[in-house]
């Protein structure tokens, strides 16, 4: 068998730091066994059979220039074999985030922190941090390790499935190259790292008869939970067009009316969302809708002004283990307090 | 010669923006993170922000968090920092640094000094 | 944010005297503490690495111990040219952050 460890890596490579001491082995001979060493392609001895060095070659500092094929012989002239040298720097602690969607999963990813120029690749795992009495952390088998699955196709991105929202994650992302490995860990709590997908579907509408109403709907995102145990706020944002400034109001569930937009304008609307008790950050605001207020008169028909402000309210019951997806949201309201002004005058 | 210039800086009112480079020379930049550290007149070193070789993780202090953005040109050997929302507390030395790894400083330039006053 | 305080903020020493300067994080860093020498007008300066090893180039005189929470930085026996202030700095969390510094001049 041959003397030379295979370190990881294709196989007839071996590898060195730049700067330091490397030694080259032949991987065909028996160890101790003396060897004379060429550069391929070339006629000049490197090193003979009589430096006592036995099967390996030792390079002093090595740099650049020494990185190539190299060719091993035995005393009979024999072909002990060939070696690459590839020279690089060991692995340091990669740089990892991770990030939720939702409250049952989440994903980290990495980067390394510094390019080693060898093959890399990366074992990524993590366990449940269990806090055992006032101070101590003892490991117990139900908290891991488990295997962070890696993306396919090389994305340096692992997903946890299945995460419990109230516990904290240690993540160990270890970078492994053939002269080392590196590992960082991360420790995680979902509520910290949850950002939802901005809100869906926004749609913006103009309120017949209502020169500066704008009425805007839309949807939880998709990759949130259909059966919430927790439940999103919203916040919104709107401007006129070739307006700089953005106003901004918190609805109350999935539609707002807007009741100062300015007449004949088109306005600008886009809209955000949040864990309904703060955990995490807000999402990123949602790709912008347009609508315009409506220039037509008002409704033949207006409902009687109790009519308008008596609309059942659906709330989640307060004691229920898993509130419904918020689909059914109050009515839209056609008038509301912020406008008195509009009112009566929409109304006399 | 290994060495990194940084440029940029000077005196700006508050709620002004200032643009920071730093131009790297005599190594390989492509393969090293980079950071900013700055230094208030009479005072200690404050991290600033980090940047990985790829550009693909950046990391902020909360201090400058939504204000400031890291940033590196790998073709043009150059890391930037852009500054906004400045305030009288950023005034500082900045100082580039490069790695090795993430968060030990082997290089650093001679810093530029930004000024935040009205 | 893990917090750095160094102890003392400042001394004096005779030239050849043994100094020594200590570091504490409020968490467990392992051994990723750093230690820099920053002189008057000049950029800072990596002398220590991980705790105990010492920058290609660093006179030996200037060392590094410690893990976990504690940690000193000792110059064997100061010099004139050692007049600066020396920053610890850890970077076990992806955030680092220096101590205070400590400044030291000659008696």
């Known amino acids: 068998s041959s003397p030379c460890p295979q370190a990881w890596g294709p196989p007839g490579v071996q590898y060195g730091q730049p700067g330091r001491s490397v030694k080259l082995c032949c991987p065909g001979v028996t160890a101790g066994d003396p060897v004379s060493w060429f550069r391929d392609g070339e006629p000049k001895l490197l090193q003979g059979p009589d430096s006592g060095l036995g099967h390996e070659l030792v390079l002093a500092q090595a740099d650049s220039t020494d990185e190539g094929t190299y060719i091993c012989q035995t005393l009979d002239g024999a072909l002990g074999g060939t070696v690459t040298l590839q020279l690089g720097y060991p692995p340091a602690r990669p740089v990892v985030s991770c990030q939720a969607a939702d409250y049952e999963n989440f994903s980290c990813t990495w980067s390394p922190s510094q390019i080693s120029g060898l093959p890399t690749r990366y074992l990524t795992s993590y366990r449940k941090k269990t806090v055992l009495g006032a101070d101590s952390q003892r490991r117990s088998p139900s908290t891991g390790p488990w295997p962070c699955p890696q993306d396919p196709l090389g994305a340096a991105r692992c997903v946890v499935h299945g995460a419990e929202f109230w516990s904290q994650y240690r993540i160990n992302v270890t970078e492994v190259n053939p002269l080392g490995a590196s590992t960082r860990l991360l420790d995680v709590s979902l509520q910290s790292i949850l950002r939802p997908d901005p809100p869906q579907g926004l749609r913006v509408e103009s309120v017949p008869g209502y020169p500066r109403r704008l009425r805007a709907s839309w949807t939880y995102p998709a990759s949130w939970p259909c059966q919430p145990h927790f439940l999103l706020k919203f916040r919104l944002q709107y401007r006129p067009a070739q307006h700089p400034a953005w106003s901004t109001v918190e609805p109350a569930g999935l539609e707002e009316v807007i009741t100062d937009a300015v007449a004949g304008l088109p306005h600008a609307v886009r809209v955000s969302a949040r864990d309904f008790l703060d955990a995490g950050t807000w999402s990123t605001w949602s790709p912008e809708a347009w609508g315009t207020p409506s220039t037509g008169t008002i409704p033949k028909e207006i409902p009687a002004w109790g009519q308008l402000h008596t609309q059942p309210e659906v709330e989640p019951q307060v004691d229920s283990p898993a509130p419904p997806r918020p689909s059914l949201q109050p009515h839209p309201r056609l008038l509301d307090h912020r406008d008195s002004v509009e009112q009566v005058a929409v109304l006399a | 010669e290994v060495q990194l210039l940084e440029s940029g800086g000077g005196l700006v009112q508050p709620g002004g923006s200032l643009r920071l480079s730093c131009a790297a020379s005599?190594?390989?930049?492509?393969?090293?993170?980079m950071t900013w550290v700055r230094q208030a007149p009479g005072k200690g070193l404050e991290w600033v922000s980090s940047?990985?070789?790829?550009?693909?993780?950046?990391q902020y202090a909360d201090s400058v968090k939504g204000r400031f953005t890291i940033s590196r040109d790998n073709s043009k050997n150059t890391l930037y920092l852009q500054m906004n929302s400045l305030r009288a507390e950023d005034t500082a030395v900045y100082y580039c640094?490069?790695?090795?790894?993430?968060?030990?400083?082997?290089?650093w330039g001679r810093g530029t000094l930004v000024t935040v006053s009205s | 944010d893990i917090q750095m305080t160094q102890s003392p903020s400042s001394l004096s020493a005779s030239v050849g005297d043994r100094v020594t300067i200590t570091c504490q994080a409020s968490?467990?860093?392992?051994?990723?503490l750093n230690w820099y020498q920053q002189k008057p007008g000049k950029a800072p300066k990596l002398l220590i690495y991980?705790?105990?090893n010492l920058q290609t180039g660093v006179p030996s005189r200037f060392s590094g111990s410690g893990s976990g929470t504690d940690f000193t930085f000792t110059i064997s026996s100061l010099q004139p040219e050692d007049i600066a202030t020396y920053y610890c700095?850890?970077?076990?969390?992806?955030?680092?952050?220096f101590g205070p510094g400590t400044k030291v001049d000659i008696k």
């Open positions: 940047i990985v070789p790829s550009g693909g993780h950046t």
């Open positions: 640094a490069k790695g090795p790894g993430w968060g030990s400083f082997d290089l």
């Open positions: 005599g190594f390989t930049f492509s393969w090293y993170s």
């Open positions: 968490q467990d860093i392992n051994n990723y």
């Open positions: 700095q850890q970077n076990e969390s992806q955030s680092p952050t």
């Open positions: 991980d705790a105990s």
